[in-house]
């Protein structure tokens, strides 16, 4: 019989008492085969973290700073359940740490030196740890003691709870630095008042502070937020302009064998029976013998944290950077205005080899990081382990939902001004063998399908989106008799046609021979009835252009396109017979890397782009013998995006809507995790 006990860790007598009450009340409402609670008492949160890691306890609820400690080795804990605040309809699990300024003050984030600062309190998250952690490497050396470095960075401050004797500048704007509401500039509202009164130039608070203090929109319009990219935004655009997004209060468990499903089952049932306004005799979010015992008193309920989400992703790049800077106190030696090498994310070993060659040729400008799937690469870019990669539009959508931004677009047509003219896109097509003359768009049911990969534009999002509109369900593996759609569940019929050996079967990378445009076309040639690819795929792999044994004798005339009106046309008539226009592949990165990635890639394409004529004797960035490694092989240049610099603007309303409709069919664990952080 599996042990269905969750050992909750309590950090005080009062918590232990509440835990026992929780245990007893749960026993009274949950069947004997359901989850149960046991209580473990420890002296501190850090002791609880260690106990969970050592399998002496299973769960505890932590503030963000402690979630970071819990994640660090050797603890390796992960977030499993989040408390939410507000309403069930609009649950808030995060708050945003922001830098508020007056509208007419004219400086940016990188010009804070010499300004006057208002903080909620020394050592507090939004008011101190996050802003000072993010500014850490701009502070004058020596950076220890930290208070002295901060005092020397700003021209004056109010940092309640600081030592006014040792660091008088930190108390210059609020004499005495009182650590309670007796100090008019203490806490969130106090720090904002410090700005409002004109004592300070910037207030470090949370996003809701300004709304709680200024009910009138006209008053709020006198303030702006400083963004990390050295721009400003209105105060209601905090989701796009903040210092960090911080989880409020989170249940953590072991990463391996951590009982996360059981913990969720327990807490979900607990909130049903003892949540807000549910029961008089025991209330989960109430602490008669103290404050915030086990859970925050202000919580309204729990949400399950998506399983793909580790602590780094949950806390977010900015928060992790800030806390790591404060804890480790290390800064790069290079001057900050110089670009560090761009860490390119390469998929599996084929791309890694090409990336390594690029790295050798780039003279220190490019480094390489490997991952097994595109989603793993996106996650690495999010958390700073990697910086950039070029993505199909379907993954630009996921990357965008995860906070990444497009920086340059692949262009596929030769033109005089290639780098300045991003193209409208390419065509997604359905290809069949000419010999299968009865096959049309309207009778694909039961046929064998070949896809570039799940989640990609031409190979999945466009054809499956169109199909979904017709069949109104997501069971595409039942619609086709079998197929190869790399990235599908291994036991799916959409992995049956794939050719990868062993663990590589149906993997969404080049270890699967039927992956990508060329792979999907090969699948059609060798096994399938229809391939969903781009309009250039057939000509690029026929007429001797692909020397591989399977392709060298193929003839373009032996293939036709399926049109949406039920007719068929020759391959060259793609402009009048396609499924949809697809946005070109694009390079994505984190916002903080945007300028450097742009600069370095433009240099790199001038050295190794399509101006290089002899690719056998020189490194060519856009060539890999039809394998589309790192970039599509038909890339002519990487083009500036001009104002199409967000994923929505880049992909276009129509495509974003189409992918949004397919979201109900999405198997992307990363998309699920990212929409948890930003619904």
């Amino acid at each position: 019989v599996p042990d269905k006990t969750v050992r909750w860790c309590a950090v005080s007598e009062h918590e232990a008492t509440k835990c026992q009450s929780f245990r007893d009340h749960m026993k009274s409402v949950i069947p004997s085969d359901g989850p149960s609670v046991a209580c473990v008492k420890k002296a501190s949160y850090l002791d609880c973290i260690r106990a969970i890691a050592a399998n002496e306890a299973d769960a505890v609820t932590l503030d963000a700073g402690l979630v970071y400690d819990a994640y660090l080795a050797p603890n390796n804990l992960k977030p499993v359940v989040a408390e939410f605040y507000g309403s069930k309809e609009d649950p808030q699990t995060f708050y945003y740490a922001v830098a508020v300024v007056k509208k007419d003050s004219g400086f940016q984030m990188n010009q804070l030196r010499g300004k006057k600062s208002c903080h909620t309190g020394l050592g507090r998250s939004a008011g101190w740890n996050i802003p000072i952690g993010l500014l850490y490497c701009d502070l004058p050396e020596p950076r220890k003691p930290l208070e002295k470095a901060v005092a020397n960075f700003f021209s004056g401050s109010c940092a309640p709870c600081a030592d006014g004797t040792d660091f008088p500048q930190l108390c210059q704007l609020c004499p005495g630095c009182g650590c309670s509401t007796l100090n008019q500039y203490f806490g969130y509202s106090g720090a904002f008042k410090c700005l409002k009164d004109g004592a300070g130039d910037v207030a470090f608070v949370k996003h809701s502070t300004i709304f709680e203090n200024l009910a009138n929109k006209a008053d709020r319009d006198q303030y702006e937020l400083l963004c990390l990219d050295n721009t400003r935004k209105p105060v209601d655009e905090y989701k796009d302009c903040h210092l960090a997004q911080v989880p409020s209060h989170t249940v953590v468990a072991r990463s391996m064998g951590g009982k996360e499903d059981l913990i969720w089952e327990l807490l979900n049932q607990a909130q049903e029976h003892f949540g807000k306004d549910k029961s008089k005799e025991f209330q989960l979010f109430s602490s008669p013998h103290g404050k915030d015992l086990l859970f925050k008193d202000s919580a309204h309920g729990f949400l399950k944290v998506p399983p793909r989400m580790d602590a780094k992703m949950y806390l977010g790049y900015e928060y992790v950077t800030a806390i790591r800077n404060l804890r480790e106190g290390t800064c790069p030696e290079a001057p900050t205005d110089e670009c560090k090498p761009v860490k390119w994310c390469a998929l599996s070993h084929h791309e890694r080899l090409k990336c390594d060659e690029w790295s050798v040729n780039s003279v220190g400008k490019i480094e390489c990081v490997s991952a097994e799937t595109t989603e793993d690469c996106i996650a690495k870019i999010m958390n700073g382990e990697a910086d950039a990669m070029s993505l199909d539009g379907g993954f630009v959508y996921i990357a965008g939902k995860c906070g990444l931004v497009p920086v340059l677009a692949e262009n596929y047509n030769k033109s005089d001004n290639c780098e300045d003219t991003p193209e409208a896109g390419y065509f997604a097509i359905a290809v069949v063998k000419k010999s299968a003359s009865d096959l049309t768009w309207d009778n694909l049911k039961g046929k064998k399908s070949c896809h570039t990969a799940v989640g990609r534009t031409a190979g999945w999002n466009i054809p499956m989106g169109l199909l979904y509109n017709k069949i109104n369900h997501c069971r595409f593996d039942e619609f086709f008799s079998e197929g190869c759609a790399p990235g599908s569940k291994k036991d799916s019929s959409l992995c049956k046609l794939c050719m990868g050996s062993g663990l590589n079967l149906c993997e969404p990378n080049n270890k699967e021979g039927y992956y990508g445009y060329t792979g999907a076309f090969r699948c059609l040639v060798e096994k399938g009835d229809v391939a969903f690819v781009k309009h250039q795929t057939v000509p690029q792999n026929t007429g001797g252009k692909n020397p591989d044994p399977w392709a060298k004798n193929l003839n373009e005339k032996d293939y036709e396109l399926l049109c949406l009106d039920g007719t068929r046309k020759p391959v060259e008539e793609y402009a009048n017979c396609h499924l949809a226009r697809a946005p070109n592949h694009a390079v994505v990165t984190r916002k903080d890397k945007e300028a450097c990635v742009h600069k370095i890639l433009r240099q790199q394409q001038h050295l190794f782009g399509s101006n290089v004529t002899d690719c056998s004797g020189n490194f060519c960035l856009f060539r890999s013998e039809t394998k589309d490694l790192l970039f599509r092989d038909d890339t002519v240049c990487l083009a500036k995006l001009h104002d199409r610099n967000t994923y929505e603007k880049y992909l276009g309303e129509e495509y974003v809507k189409a992918v949004g409709n397919l979201r109900k069919c999405s198997t992307s664990s990363l998309l699920e995790a990212c929409t948890f952080r930003r619904p």
Epitope: L353, E357, N361, V363, S616, G617, F619, S624, L629
Partner: nanobody, 117 residues
């Protein structure tokens, strides 16, 4: 097709030196980039050092200052001079000509380097 044959490995004490050679059966003069990789048991194959046709080099952080890569286009050979060897340098060392290696798994047999006292 150019075949690559690695040699020069062996057993050496910590602090010792070895010089690996990679001989090509055809011309390497036109190959854009040549490189040495290594693979320790249970680990991924990793780039140790690379050299472009023009002589630009790159080294893994773990070998910087200890290893030197060079190429002799006339002799169709690439070398890896390894000094101040450490136990963690123990691995099979492979040489590759990038112009083919990422289209097909184009690797030689490699040469075993063991650093042990």
């Amino acid at each position: 097709q150019v075949q690559l044959v690695e040699s020069g490995g062996g057993l050496v004490q910590p602090g010792g030196s070895l010089r690996l050679s990679c001989a090509a059966s055809g011309s390497i003069g036109s190959s854009a980039t040549m490189a040495w990789y290594r693979q320790a048991p249970g680990k991924q194959r990793e780039l140790v050092a690379g050299i472009t046709r023009g002589g630009t080099t790159k080294y893994a952080d773990s070998v910087k200052g200890r290893f030197t890569i060079s190429r002799d286009n006339a002799e169709n050979t690439v070398y890896l001079q390894m000094n101040s060897l450490k136990p963690e340098d123990t691995a099979v060392y492979y040489c590759t000509d990038y112009s083919r290696s990422y289209y097909e798994d184009h690797w030689g047999q490699g040469t075993q380097v063991t650093v042990s006292s």
